[in-house]
């Protein structure tokens, strides 16, 4: 028997006729045991369908009466087998059994899909005792059914270590289609086919699927769920959803955006984080990725000097962390810097170019042709040199640093002199006689001290010795510097 909840279900007596021993249906129960509080009556369905033999579990009592007549087999009476109703409606169903009074402590439990229903369910057991038997009615009600209430319900009773099981009552809760798989947002290549999947279930079945693209239904004919939509390709972004319908109504999935992969937008906000004489640290804000992950970026550097040859240096780097240190640059130079990034589709345009400058650096070469000679009459050492090439000064020359080390009889003493940038000679006082003086010179800019020249040694004799010829650094390509006497 199938009963639709929204049809007119009329309540009727729990028992269509008296129980053995003249129990009438209008008797009030002597004992009512609610399994949970808050019971509310709901739709009531016929608990009995007399007339056919019971097929469920039966307990045959071994006890006999004084006349030794065997008691009839114990079994639950037949009840409604299948209840169909809409979501959020109420339902009530029951099991009933007549138990000889010789049995004590009989309890009925409710089970759903093989699991006992414990806790706050609206279950009530009522007992109607008579001379020989007690009629027991176990009622189960659900005030607002949900899909999760779908299933097979049975009653169980334990008696004499025997278990009596009722026929199942199948509850089918019908409602709008329920999505088990909805389409997902995707980023796709232009004019390339892709699939979208939609699946919804009832009950009631069947569930049919219509696909919607940009508010227009794609298919005139529905497809039975599950449905796979093959889109042959798109040239522009589209929004897809699916509509599932069954005999209860329509449910619409979330709308998903299908984006077309494109080349990225150029990076923005390229900025200078730090400058040194030979490197510039830049950062940038990536542009829109074109719906495809960035793979790498390219930093383009060109000299801003109008007299330069206009060649572009290219430095490739990973897309993260949007930071790159450009190296091997000249000091005190102006550069134009642009950034471009790529994804699987291609390279972005170059960002707006920015101007950046390297700072002054320490000179990269030492002064040339350093010569040293002793002026014994004034007890001085004269030093001469040539200033380094302008290009390699890496900044504006502010002077020179002279290191002179005096060594004699195990004693060593280094002194440093700073001289101005004008001129290319210096005079230092003899510090120790009968000693070797080692001289090195470095050019100095605001960027720092450059490398020292190769050492030039001169021997300072004791008083009264003859003058010596000057010592000098060799010309490029010559042998090591030597003391010239």
């Amino acid at each position: 028997a199938i009963t639709e909840a929204r049809e007119e279900a009329k309540p009727y007596p729990l028992f269509p006729g008296p129980f053995p021993g003249s129990l009438q249906t209008d008797h009030t129960p002597l004992l009512s045991l609610p399994h949970a509080s808050g019971y509310q009556p709901a739709l009531m369905f016929s608990p009995t369908q007399p007339g056919r033999p019971h097929t469920g579990n039966v307990a045959i009592p071994q006890v006999t009466s004084v006349e030794s007549k065997p008691l009839p087999p114990l079994a639950f009476k037949h009840t409604v087998g299948h209840i169909i109703l809409s979501e959020h409606k109420g339902v009530k169903f029951n099991c009933s059994i007549s138990v000889p009074n010789i049995y004590q402590d009989t309890t009925i439990s409710w089970w759903k899909d093989g699991k006992e229903l414990l806790g706050a369910h609206h279950a009530i057991t009522q007992f109607y005792p008579d001379d020989e038997v007690t009629a027991i009615i176990a009622s189960f009600s659900i005030t607002s059914v949900q899909r999760s209430d779908n299933g097979s319900y049975i009653c169980k009773m334990k008696i004499n270590n025997e278990e009596i099981v009722s026929d199942p009552i199948y509850i089918e809760v019908q409602g709008l289609p329920h999505f088990t798989k909805q389409p997902e947002s995707m980023n796709v290549t232009r004019n390339t086919a892709f699939n979208l999947t939609c699946q919804a279930v009832g009950p009631p079945e069947p569930v049919n699927i219509f696909w919607v693209q940009n508010s227009s239904r794609v298919n005139e004919q529905p497809e039975k769920s599950p449905s796979v939509l093959t889109v042959p390709g798109l040239t522009e972004m589209a929004v897809f959803s699916c509509e599932a319908h069954n005999d209860k109504g329509l449910t619409v999935s979330k709308g998903v955006q299908i984006n077309i992969k494109a080349i990225p937008s150029p990076p923005t906000e390229v900025s200078i984080r730090n400058s040194t004489a030979h490197s510039i640290l830049i950062s940038w804000v990536p542009g829109f990725d074109g719906y495809s992950p960035f793979r790498n970026c390219s930093i383009q550097v060109k000299e801003a000097d109008p007299l330069s040859n206009g060649s572009v240096m290219i430095f490739n780097t990973s897309a993260l962390p949007h930071l790159y240190q450009i190296k091997q640059l000249q000091a005190l130079a102006n550069y134009s810097i642009g950034v471009s990034c790529m994804n699987e589709i291609g390279w972005s345009a170059v960002s707006p170019w920015i101007l950046a400058s390297t700072t002054e650096g320490a000179p990269s070469v030492a002064p040339l042709n350093v010569t040293v000679f002793l002026n014994e009459s004034s007890d001085n050492v004269d030093i001469r040199w040539m200033k380094p090439p302008t290009k390699q000064q890496d900044g504006e020359l502010v002077g020179y640093r002279i290191s002179h080390v005096w060594q004699s009889a195990g004693i060593s003493k280094e002194l440093l002199e700073e001289v101005g940038q004008n001129g290319s000679r210096a005079r230092i006082s003899v510090q120790v006689h009968n000693a070797t003086c080692t001289v090195r010179i470095a050019a100095v800019t605001r960027g720092g001290v450059g490398p020292f020249s190769d050492p030039v040694k001169i021997f300072i004799p004791a008083h009264g010795w003859v003058d010596y010829a000057p010592s000098s650094t060799p010309a490029p390509g010559n042998a090591d510097p030597v003391l010239i006497i």
Epitope: R6, P204, E205, P206, R217
Partner: antibody
Framework: QVQLKESGPGLVAPSQSLSITCTVS????????ISWVRQPPGKGLEWLGV???????DYNSALKSRLTISKDTSKNQVFLKMNSLQTDDTARYYC????????WGTGTTVTVSS | QAVVTQESALTTSPGETVTLTCRSS?????????ANWVQEKPDHLFTGLIG???SRAPGIPARFSGSLIGDKAALTITGAQTEDEAIYFC?????????FGGGTKLTVL
């Protein structure tokens, strides 16, 4: 392409019954619910009832006692039967796809007259 | 039974945007009313335009769009054309039955 085509008697005597057939092509009735709609001359549309994919029905409550909708899925046909016709049942009768009223038959004119 | 109300007539010009509305006597129109819009042209030609979740039927031009505006269902024709002159019926679903509105006669002058 989904197409619906109604066929009916044209003229029905008062108090007699009306039977109309809607033949569906391009789709199976096991996946398409069909509604019946009528339009009296010079008036608006009135929904009569629906037959669901599973064979269940719902009717316009004002006409429920006189209406029966059924179908033969194997022949892809839906049937409308209406009893006790009166002159105000004169109308053009249409079958249409249900949840989206987007596929309509061309309709069949029924005149109730003696 | 619910009563569904539409404007009896509207006039627009080609290229203009016009909105037809559909009100329910039971309260605000919601998505569960599955508002449908049906166009009737001479010789009993009915075409469903919008249905379900405000989606256009296959082949219906994008100038037709359905929506819920306030407590009413609405059909908007963006850039009306002379061939859009017709009667437009709205239908609302109430749990187990459709109710049609009286129809709006749209004139495109």
């Amino acid at each position: 392409q989904v197409q619906l085509k109604e066929s009916g008697p044209g003229l029905v005597a008062p108090s007699q019954s009306l039977s109309i057939t809607c033949t569906v092509s391009g789709i199976s009735l096991s996946s398409f619910a069909i509604s019946w709609v009528r339009q009296p001359p010079g008036k608006g549309l009135e929904w009569l009832g629906v037959i669901w994919t599973g064979g269940g029905t719902d009717y316009n409550s004002a006409l429920k006692s006189r209406l029966t909708i059924s179908k033969d899925t194997s022949k892809n046909q839906v049937f409308l039967k209406m009893n006790s016709l009166q002159t105000d049942d004169t109308a053009r009768y249409y079958c249409a796809s249900h949840w989206y009223l987007d596929v309509w038959g061309t309709g069949t004119t029924v005149t109730v007259s003696s | 039974q619910a009563v569904v109300t539409q404007e009896s007539a509207l006039t627009t010009s080609p290229g203009e945007t016009v909105t037809l509305t559909c009100r329910s006597s039971t309260g605000a129109v919601s998505t569960s009313n599955y508002a449908n819009w049906v166009q009737e042209k001479p010789d009993h030609l009915f075409t469903g335009l919008i249905g379900g979740a405000n989606s256009r039927a296959p082949g219906i031009p994008a100038r037709f769009s359905g929506s819920l505006i306030g407590d009413k269902a609405a059909l908007t024709i963006t850039g009306a054309q002379t061939e859009d002159e017709a009667i437009y019926f709205c239908a609302l679903w109430f749990s187990n039955h459709w109710v049609f509105g009286g129809g709006t006669k749209l004139t495109v002058l």
